[in-house]
C-alpha cells in the first residue's frame, strides 16, 4: 500500500455556480484536477476510485500476489478482486497472505467443512461435536479441498 492509497490529497473544487455541497466532487472512476475545475478519468487497469470524491489521484489497482488468482480485473470504478488459489485460504486475522489448508483432521475428529479460499477445513470432535481450529498434530484422513467463490477485494 502506498502513501497515496492511505492519504490521498483532497481539494474542493472552486466553482462560481454552486448549487450543492457536493458540487466540487467527481464521480467514481475519476479524480479532480489540480485546479479543482475538472474531473479526470482514472486509467483503465491502472487505477480506480469507487465513490464521489475530490482526490487529486485515483487509487492504484491491487496486483494479485503469487498464490492468488484474479477473480475480476481492476476497472476505473472497482479494485481488482483476488482470491486464494485452490488448497489455500486467507484468514481474517492474517489477510496479507494465503495459508495452506490442512489436508485432514486430527485423530478423534471428523471433517464437517471443506477448504475454501476464505477458510481452512473445519473439524469437530466425533463425540462432542465441538470445533477444533488448531494445527493438526496427526492426520487421520486425507481430504481433497474444494474451492468456493467469494468476491472480496484484496487488501
Amino acid at each position: 500500500i502506498t502513501q497515496q492509497d492511505l492519504a490521498p490529497q483532497q481539494r474542493v473544487a472552486p466553482q462560481q455556480k454552486r448549487s450543492s455541497p457536493s458540487e466540487g466532487l467527481c464521480p467514481p472512476g475519476h479524480h479532480i484536477s489540480e485546479d479543482g475545475r475538472d474531473c479526470i478519468s482514472c486509467k483503465y487497469g491502472q487505477d480506480y476510485s469507487t465513490h464521489w470524491n475530490d482526490l487529486l489521484f485515483c487509487l492504484r489497482c491491487t496486483r494479485c500476489d503469487s498464490g492468488e488468482v484474479e477473480l475480476s480485473p481492476c476497472t476505473t470504478t472497482r479494485n481488482t478482486v483476488c482470491q486464494c488459489e485452490e488448497g489455500t485460504f486467507r484468514e481474517e486475522d492474517s489477510p496479507e497472505m494465503c495459508r495452506k489448508c490442512r489436508t485432514g483432521c486430527p485423530r478423534g475428529m471428523v471433517k464437517v467443512g471443506d477448504c475454501t479460499p476464505w477458510s481452512d477445513i473445519e473439524c469437530v470432535h466425533k463425540e462432542s461435536g465441538t470445533k477444533h481450529s488448531g494445527e493438526a498434530p496427526a492426520v487421520e484422513e486425507t481430504v481433497t479441498s474444494s474451492p468456493g467463490t467469494p468476491a472480496s477485494p484484496c487488501s
Partner: antibody, heavy 119, light 107 residues
C-alpha cells in the same frame, strides 16, 4: 426498458428564459448521472453539464455555466435545464443522456428537444 | 479543453466495403474514447467506449482501436443502414468533447 422522455419543441423570444425537462424511467433514477448535450443544426455535439440525483452533484461546462441551470425533481424522476438570456445562438436541439457512475460515455439518450429563439 | 478532430467530414464507401473513420485528440486521452452513430432526426447511439469495447447489442462489424491521441472506428463490411453520421467523444477529462462528425456516404 430505459427511457428518457424530453419535453416538446419550444419557440421563444430573444432575452427570455426556457425550462426543458427530461423524465427518466425504467431504471433507478438516483443511480445514474444525467447530462445535457447541445446540437446546433447541421453541427456537432457539445456537452453542457451533468446532474447526479444521488447526491445532487452538478457540474457545468465552463462555456455554459452562465447560460444553463440544472435541477431535478426526484419525486417525478425528472431533470430540468433552464436556459436564460436566450439569443439565436441558443437555437439548437438539446438532448438529455445518462451514464453510469463511471466513464463518461452516454448509453441512453432522450429524443431531443428543439429550441428555436426568434422574435 | 481537449479538441477532437475528425479530419474527414464526408467519406465515400460502398455496401460490403471496409471503412475506417479516424479521430485525433489534441492531447493523450488514455483510450477514454467513445464512438456514436447518429441517424437523421434521431439521437446519437453509443457504439464503442474505452476505445475498443463494443456496447451491448452493437453488431461485431463495428470495431474500435487506438491509443494516445489517435483513434479509429472500423466497419468491416458496410451495410446500407450504416451510411450515416459518426462522432467520436473523449471521456478522459471534463469538459467532455466530441469530434465534428464524419458522414458515411454511398460512393
Amino acid at each position: 426498458k430505459v427511457q428518457l422522455q424530453q419535453s416538446g419543441a419550444e419557440l421563444v423570444k430573444p432575452g427570455a428564459s426556457v425550462k426543458l425537462s427530461c423524465k427518466a424511467s425504467g431504471y433507478t433514477f438516483t443511480e445514474y448521472i444525467l447530462h445535457w448535450v447541445k446540437q446546433k443544426s447541421g453541427q456537432g455535439l457539445e456537452w453542457i453539464g451533468w446532474f447526479y440525483p444521488g447526491n445532487n452533484n452538478i457540474k457545468y461546462n465552463e462555456k455554459f455555466k452562465d447560460k444553463a441551470t440544472l435541477t431535478a425533481d426526484k419525486s417525478s424522476s425528472t431533470v430540468y435545464m433552464e436556459l436564460s438570456r436566450l439569443t439565436s445562438e441558443d437555437s439548437a436541439v438539446y438532448f438529455c443522456a445518462r451514464h453510469e457512475q463511471g466513464p463518461g460515455y452516454f448509453d441512453y439518450w432522450g429524443q431531443g428537444t428543439t429550441l428555436t429563439v426568434s422574435s | 479543453d481537449i479538441v477532437m478532430t475528425q479530419s474527414h467530414k464526408f467519406m465515400s464507401t460502398s455496401v460490403g466495403d471496409r471503412v475506417s473513420i479516424t479521430c485525433k485528440a489534441s492531447q493523450d486521452v488514455n483510450t477514454a474514447v467513445a464512438w456514436y452513430q447518429q441517424k437523421p432526426g434521431q439521437s446519437p447511439k453509443l457504439l464503442i467506449y474505452w476505445a475498443s469495447t463494443r456496447h451491448t447489442g452493437v453488431p461485431d462489424r463495428f470495431t474500435g482501436s487506438g491509443s494516445g491521441t489517435d483513434y479509429t472506428l472500423t466497419i468491416k463490411s458496410v451495410q446500407a443502414e450504416d451510411l450515416t453520421l459518426y462522432y467520436c467523444q473523449q471521456h478522459y477529462i471534463t469538459p467532455w468533447t466530441f469530434g465534428g462528425g464524419t458522414k458515411l456516404e454511398i460512393k
